[in-house]
């Protein structure tokens, strides 16, 4: 039960992270004109991965895309790269997701293949989440660069008499969205991984008990149908583990990939 | 077509109160921000004050700042501005003027001459 | 405050005539955003509400013969009349659109000869 709660949240928390990555990738206010301490101006500027927009006070807004790719910044396209590969990991994590959710039974599958599937959505969401948290961190250090670099020289002009107000632009909504977004699917994709382990095929953990009779040992495992019988000196070769009734052949049987969980 | 009518008092004694209002027809009021621009008789435009077409946002002339209030009721579609504590240096004709693209005042209003005097 | 200083304060000329008035500003008026200059022209006749002319520095509003032009960019702007007509004896006003508080400059009164 847990383990299906764990993987439905970490899955409804992904998809929170996912449709928050697509809609801090759209959005416009990446970044905003900053207006402390500046001049009052009735047009406010700002912009996005996309375009950006000019908002007049009388209400009107003009928004411009960025109709050329060779002329943008190579932060730009980088940021606009690690959020699209965010977007893309992110939805084909929530498509193997679906089918690896273990309230939704599909044919036949075995808990083994619904535990792959988990572990794989989970890293998909991990790896989707710290590339949106890479894409807006990147964006938001050229803010900050750009930002002193323009204080620096806030004011220019011909002998202090016409003065050319330099707009600065500081962090839009769209880094916020970004971040949260970006912090949820990466919460969500651990909470994939840690449901993949309950979901590897259950083990039972029951102490064995041993019964001797003469000329061969027995072991028996109770609530189980297995027993494992041996003869004389192969007896070492069946180990009885104390946490469980299993043997050594038992437990390379299992795959091995889920133990570094 | 687009109209903006003023209506106001007209004569007012010094350190007084009054209003303006401006009544909007022919088109969304809701959707356009507007401003009052005054004209001593006499002499050249000044811009008062601005309100955003929510009403959430004002912006005033420094040399008004404190003593007049702009407002609208988008339910009614009208503009009115508030004067206080006026003095005979108020003395002027108060347009309603509607902003459109570039932030500049497409319609105006025919004017309400405001005198102040005791 | 945005300085808006208009030249001349006024003139005279004969019908026909290219009439041309400077506004110049004390901040530059040009956005970075869109790259446009936030200068508004405005003809004023007497007794009467001003109208708009042009916006955007160059934009002309509709309805507004074509023989209304504006040019220039930054803090030097320039409103021209290519040919003047009795119908265009009025105050001409040009105003900043862009800084808080929005202001305009002292005007232009044109006249005919």
């Known amino acids: 039960m847990a383990v299906t709660a764990c993987q439905g949240l970490g899955f409804v928390v992904s998809l929170i992270g996912i449709a928050g990555i697509i809609a801090a990738t759209c959005m416009d206010q990446w970044s905003t004109q900053d207006l402390y301490n500046n001049p009052v101006t009735a047009v406010f500027n700002y912009q996005g991965l996309w375009r950006s927009c000019v908002r007049e006070s009388s209400g009107f807004t003009e928004c411009r895309g960025y109709f050329t790719l060779l002329g943008l910044p190579a932060m730009l396209q980088a940021v606009r790269a690690l959020m699209i590969v965010g977007i893309v990991l992110g939805a084909i994590g929530l498509l193997v997701s679906i089918f690896a959710l273990k309230c939704i039974r599909i044919g036949s599958m075995e808990d083994s293949a619904k535990a792959n599937m988990t572990l794989t959505s989970g890293i998909m969401f991990i790896v989707s989440g710290l590339c949106a948290i890479a894409g807006v961190s990147v964006f938001a250090n050229m803010l900050v660069t750009n930002f002193w670099m323009s204080t620096a020289n806030m004011y220019t002009g011909m002998g202090g008499m016409v003065q050319t107000v330099q707009t600065r632009y500081t962090f839009g909504a769209a880094l916020f969205v970004g971040w949260v977004a970006g912090g949820l699917t990466l919460i969500g994709g651990v909470m994939m991984c840690i449901a993949c382990r309950g979901l590897a095929p259950e083990e039972t953990n029951y102490k064995a008990v041993s019964y001797h009779a003469s000329g061969h040992s027995v072991a028996y495992k109770p609530g189980g149908f297995k027993a494992s019988t041996g003869f004389g000196s192969n007896t070492k070769n069946k180990k009885i583990y104390d946490g469980g009734a299993r043997t050594e052949d038992e437990v390379q049987s299992y795959p091995s990939k889920h133990d570094y969980v | 077509q687009v109209q903006l009518q003023e209506s106001g008092p007209g004569l007012v004694r010094p350190s007084q109160t009054l209003s303006l209002t401006c009544t909007a027809s022919?088109?969304?009021?809701?959707?356009?921000?507007m401003s009052w621009v005054r004209q001593p008789p006499g002499r050249g435009l000044e811009w008062v004050a601005f309100?955003?077409?929510?009403?959430?946002?004002?912006e005033y002339n420094p040399s008004v700042k404190g003593r007049f209030t702009i407002l609208r009721d988008n339910s009614k579609n009208q503009l009115s501005l508030k004067l206080s504590s006026v003095t005979a240096a108020d003395t002027a004709v108060y347009y309603c003027a509607r902003h459109d693209k570039g932030n500049a005042l497409d319609y105006w209003g025919q004017g309400s001459l405001v005198t102040v005097s005791s | 405050d945005i300085q808006m200083t208009q030249s001349p304060s006024s003139l005279s000329a004969s019908v026909g005539d290219r009439v041309t008035i400077t506004c110049k500003s004390s901040q530059s008026l040009l956005n970075s955003g869109n790259q446009k200059n936030y200068l508004t022209w405005y003809q004023q006749k007497p007794g009467k509400a001003p109208k708009l002319l042009i916006y955007w520095a160059s934009n002309l509003q509709t309805g507004v013969p074509s023989r209304f032009s504006g040019s220039g960019s930054g803090t030097d702007f320039t409103f021209t009349i290519s040919s003047l007509q009795p119908e265009d004896i009025a105050t001409y006003y040009c105003q900043n659109d862009y800084f808080y508080p929005l202001t305009f400059g002292q005007g232009t009164k044109v006249e005919i000869k």
């Open positions: 022919g088109f969304t009021f809701s959707k356009y921000a």
């Open positions: 309100i955003s077409n929510g009403g959430s946002y004002t």
